[in-house]
Amino acid sequence: AYRPSETLCGGELVDTLQFVCGDRGFYFSRPASRVSRRSRGIVEECCFRSCDLALLETYCATPAKSE
């Protein structure tokens, strides 16, 4: 379970994103260039500092709109 305002790194960060984002998924893999502002951002915020639920949710993917 997610514990608010803590440092999250490695697999624990990935698992927490999966928990928070659920079926929406999240921005995980970098593109072929291996550069991703999103990926770098969540690492800086959540592993090297600490992050809360609201920040984690900003990395969840937006579900495709159904027609």
Epitope: T7, G10, G11, D15
Partner: antibody, heavy 122, light 107 residues
Framework: EVQLLESGGGLVQPGGSLRLSCAAS???????IMWWVRQAPGKGLEWVS?????????LYADSVKGRFTISRDNSKNTLYLQMNSLRAEDTAVYYC???????????????WGQGTMVTVSS | DIQMTQSPSSLSASVGDRVTITCRAS??????LNWYQQKPGKAPKLLIY???TLQSGVPSRFSGSGSGTDFTLTISSLQPEDFATYYC?????????FGQGTKVEIK
């Protein structure tokens, strides 16, 4: 060829300082999280420190916190480890390594340097 | 901190043998377990990450399995170049910790 090359090791007295360098080549250094890992003679591997790709974030093992400082110069493709207040128990081969994943170590360390020996003794 | 315990600490085997090394975590680490091979005087080499994914360029005789707290590295048919020390490492969270190593020696 993707390569990491450490330098700066040597013999230092307890309480002394050393600065290790790790020169990267063959890949876009600024895109990767980087690590220092050490291995005392005849012993296992121990994580020392990690730095984010931009250099804006750092973490340290409790055993070196407050004494060691990790940094990087992306314009020079070089990783550093400043080691102060050295102790006998810091004697080890120090390796730099490249992160294999996206979220700080979750896929291990895929490229390692050859290591540089640090001996702390009077 | 998460403690990693490998067994056995050493083993003797012959070329062609099937070799199994186990690694146990002191708490659940999901599948965030990596395996390295180290030869004397050399740097470690990543073999397997996230428990079962073979690193690029690593021979298919190496395989990994497990989840939670119990993990296994298997060498299906030991080759002369496989005599080395093998380390497991948890990558679930900080501090990133390694097992004490398993030395695979020639019988």
């Amino acid at each position: 060829e993707v390569q990491l090359l450490e330098s700066g090791g040597g013999l230092v007295q307890p309480g002394g300082s050393l600065r290790l360098s790790c020169a990267a080549s063959g890949f876009t250094f600024s895109n990767y999280i980087m690590w220092w890992v050490r291995q005392a003679p005849g012993k296992g591997l121990e994580w020392v420190s990690v730095i984010s790709s931009s250099g804006g974030g750092t973490l340290y093992a409790d055993s070196v916190k407050g004494r060691f400082t990790i940094s990087r110069d992306n314009s020079k493709n070089t990783l550093y480890l400043q080691m102060n207040s050295l102790r006998a128990e810091d004697t080890a081969v120090y390796y730099c390594a490249r992160d294999n994943g996206d979220y700080v170590g979750e896929k291990g360390f895929d490229i390692w340097g050859q290591g540089t020996m640090v001996t702390v003794s009077s | 901190d998460i403690q990693m315990t490998q067994s056995p600490s050493s083993l003797s085997a012959s070329v062609g043998d099937r070799v199994t090394i186990t690694c146990r975590a002191s708490q659940s680490i999901s599948n965030y377990l990596n395996w390295y091979q180290q030869k004397p005087g050399k740097a470690p080499k990543l073999l397997i990450y996230t428990a079962s994914t073979l690193q690029s360029g690593v021979p298919s005789r190496f395989s990994g399995s497990g989840s939670g707290t119990d993990f296994t590295l298997t060498i299906s048919s030991l080759q002369p170049e496989d005599f080395a020390t093998y380390y497991c490492q948890q990558s679930y969270n900080s501090p990133w910790t390694f097992g004490q190593g398993t030395k695979v020696e020639i019988k």
